[in-house]
Amino acid sequence: EPPTACREKQYLINSQCCSLCQPGQKLVSDCTEFTETECLPCGESEFLDTWNRETHCHQHKYCDPNLGLRVQQKGTSETDTICTCEEGWHCTSEACESCVLHRSCSPGFGVKQIATGVSDTICEPCPVGFFSNVSSAFEKCHPWTSCETKDLVVQQAGTNKTDVVCGPQDRLR
């Protein structure tokens, strides 16, 4: 009696169970009464990453330098190429199909987490006692200068964008 279901790594065709092709190979002929499933290796720059009955291998992803992409891991016959972004850029999605420039944190904000190839800069507002006076993708909020430790006094209060201005203490004459 013809099978209605097949074992793992097999598929049903023409009332018989045929072996699937292993990762890295594509199907060129279903099995017959007289022959096993016939598979051929994927070509250069192609891959298949599962047991399959695909008649065409998939093309490796192209890491387009015009989109800021570069190869993080070269593809094999069984794996796709993994792209990442050039220094200073990060992926716009999990699939990393294009890159955008890392965001800079504006004055008044500091870098909480430096960007990676896959995540953007995370900024945070500078809390009281800290400031940032530059637009930067790397600079954290800096603490206000402590005038006291320099034996000086605050002449101008700091803000989230400016440091305090210290000056000499008034001397009693």
Epitope: S19, V28, S29, T32, E33, F34, T35, E36, E38, L40
Partner: antibody, heavy 114, light 112 residues
Framework: QVQLKESGPGLVKPSETLSLTCTVS????????VHWIRQPPGKGLEWIGV???????NYNSALMSRVTISKDNSKSQVFLKMSSVTAADTAVYYC????????WGQGTLVTVSS | DVVMTQSPLSLPVTLGQPASISCRSS???????????LQWYLQRPGQSPGLLIY???NRFSGVPDRFSGSGSGTDFTLKISRVEAEDVGVYYC?????????FGQGTKLEIK
């Protein structure tokens, strides 16, 4: 029913290229492979190669450098070309449908001689 | 490539008597699927080869039941229980488990 018919010149000069055609009926070239097999007079059978449904090919490594198999799906024809032939290539050449091993063509005798 | 070795190469048999042909392969013909793709063909004088047995022991449709195939791994046998006049010709074993497909040298069966 499945039928295959081999055709081509019966005489080829040494160092020239042997060209044969296999015309098939009863099955579809876009969904089935075709093999070429040869048999020198009074000797055994030798598998030459196959062209699969999608156009991919496998060849006998001993003949690979001289053999090309191609096809024209619209004409239901498969072609065998073998370059730089010698007297050792004198044989009956058969084509065979993949999965139809019960049906062989009648074969065509190719003699390599000057 | 898988080398197929047949014996004997010549087999004179009396009509009505049994006959046996051996075929050995240089490596196992068992595919990872568990199937073994070993065929037997008969080439009658002046004709193309005709399929007798496939997958070691399956008789092709229309093949008389006096023909039987057996074996496993690398050792295979074709038996004819009672030879008839129409059985004369050259018998070939063939493997299609591994590319390139290969054939035995052939065994010529003739009537004594």
């Amino acid at each position: 029913q499945v039928q295959l018919k081999e055709s081509g010149p019966g005489l080829v000069k040494p160092s020239e290229t042997l060209s044969l055609t296999c015309t098939v009926s009863g099955f579809s070239l876009p969904t089935s492979g075709v093999h070429w097999i040869r048999q020198p007079p009074g000797k055994g059978l030798e598998w030459i190669g196959v062209i699969w449904a999608g156009g991919d090919t496998n060849y006998n490594s001993a003949l690979m450098s001289r053999v090309t198999i191609s096809k024209d799906n619209s004409k239901s024809q498969v072609f065998l070309k073998m370059s730089s032939v010698t007297a050792a290539d004198t044989a009956v050449y058969y084509c065979l449908g993949h999965g139809h091993f019960d049906v062989w063509g009648q074969g065509t005798l190719v003699t390599v001689s000057s | 490539d898988v080398v197929m070795t047949q014996s004997p190469l010549s087999l004179p048999v009396t009509l009505g008597q049994p006959a046996s042909i051996s075929c050995r392969s240089s490596q196992s013909l068992v595919h990872s699927s568990g199937n073994t793709y070993l065929q037997w063909y008969l080439q009658r004088p002046g004709q193309s080869p005709g399929l007798l047995i496939y997958k070691v022991s399956n008789r092709f449709s229309g093949v008389p039941d006096r023909f039987s195939g057996s074996g496993s791994g690398t050792d295979f046998t074709l038996k004819i229980s009672r030879v008839e006049a129409e059985d004369v010709g050259v018998y070939y074993c063939s493997q299609t488990t591994h590319v390139p497909w290969t054939f035995g040298q052939g065994t010529k069966l003739e009537i004594k």
